[in-house]
């Protein structure tokens, strides 16, 4: 069985502020078990930006539909979409574990970059 | 708070078909996830299937696959169990139950007990 | 197949750990159900290996590792007297599968 891989296809994502945003994120595997996480930025400081688990992201909606037991596919998107979005998203999967779960692999980043909404 | 209500539990023949219906409450029924579970007497929990929240993906053990059919109406906060071809074996308690992200169970109905006899 | 003690016993306040084997822990969560009598409502005591519901109280947690889960019932009560299955969701096979459930007696 190949190794879980997190892709994430596009380096970078250029959006109009006001505008919704979608970065798109597939896993090669649905083994390990465990949630995936999207965050803003890398390194301790990093911002979270969705948790297949649980929490409550009002901006953000998830492009597939995560119920599937068959899902690959985590892209998200980012309503109203500000200059204060701007940055590196990492899509991230954990593997399960106890009593934290345990960050297994992250893709390679999206660069979201925002432009001034059209006059 | 969650509801699951199940209904529909009757004494049909062998051969005979019935419709479980389930429903829901007290949360958005649209974005979970539901299975049907059931308890044959003096035995344990059986898990027969399972649908995604938008009802487009559905899942069975092998020993109900091509009898039953899961499906939902999400406008109707309703979950249901189609069975055919009822035999003896299905006589059981079934339960509704909502899945969590990771499709186990966080809640379940009360059960309706459909009993199949000559 | 999950795999689980037909039954265990214990003196109120003591610690109960029941088990359950067979599931593959890269691609297993574990869930726990009580049931008080045959044909009730199962209730849900533990869910994604170690996760207690809000409604459950602390006495109980869970555990999984290697290819077993752990119910542990902290301080155990009468009122706790249950048939309590495992059940496990494999990423594999898209299937949720139960142990035959564990008799717990207070004695």
């Known amino acids: 069985e190949d190794e879980l891989q997190v892709i994430q296809p596009e380096k970078s994502v250029s959006v109009a502020a006001g505008e919704s945003a979608t970065l798109r994120c597939a896993m090669t595997s649905l083994i390990p078990v465990g949630p995936i996480m999207w965050f803003r930025g890398a390194g301790a400081g990093r911002e979270l930006i969705y948790n297949q688990k649980e929490g409550h992201f009002p901006r953000v909606t998830t492009v597939s539909e995560l119920t599937k037991r068959n899902n690959l596919d985590f892209s998200i998107s980012i309503s109203n979409i500000t200059p204060a979005d701007a940055g590196t998203y990492y899509c991230v999967k954990f593997r399960k574990g106890s009593p934290d779960d345990v960050e297994f692999k992250s893709g390679a980043g999206t660069e979201l970059s925002v432009r001034a909404k059209p006059s | 708070d969650v509801q699951l209500v199940e209904s529909g539990g009757a004494v049909v023949r062998p051969g005979e078909s019935l419709r479980l219906s389930c429903a829901a409450s007290g949360f958005t029924f649209s974005s979970y996830a539901m299975s049907w579970v059931r308890q044959a007497p003096g035995k344990g929990l059986e898990w027969l299937a399972g649908?995604?929240?938008?009802?487009?993906?559905?899942y069975y053990i092998d020993s109900v696959k091509g009898r039953f059919t899961i499906s939902r109406d999400n406008s109707e906060n309703s979950l249901y169990l189609q069975m055919n071809s009822l035999t003896a074996e299905d006589t059981a308690v079934y339960y509704c139950a909502r899945e969590t992200w990771n499709h186990l169970f966080d809640y379940w109905g009360l059960g309706t007990l459909v009993t199949v006899s000559s | 197949a999950l795999t689980q003690p037909a039954s265990v016993s214990a003196n109120p306040g003591e610690t109960v750990k029941i088990t359950c084997s067979g599931g593959d822990w890269y691609s297993t969560y574990y869930g726990w159900y009580q049931q008080k009598s045959p044909g009730s409502a199962p209730v849900t005591v533990i869910?994604?290996?170690?996760k207690r519901p809000s409604d459950i109280p602390s006495r109980f947690s869970g555990s999984a590792s290697g290819s077993a889960a752990t119910l542990t019932i902290t301080g155990v009560r009468v009122e706790d007297e249950a048939v309590y299955y495992c059940a496990g969701y494999d990423g594999r096979t898209y299937i949720n599968t139960f142990g035959a459930g564990t008799t717990l007696t207070v004695l």
């Open positions: 869910h994604s290996d170690d």
């Open positions: 649908i995604s929240a938008g009802g487009s993906d559905t």
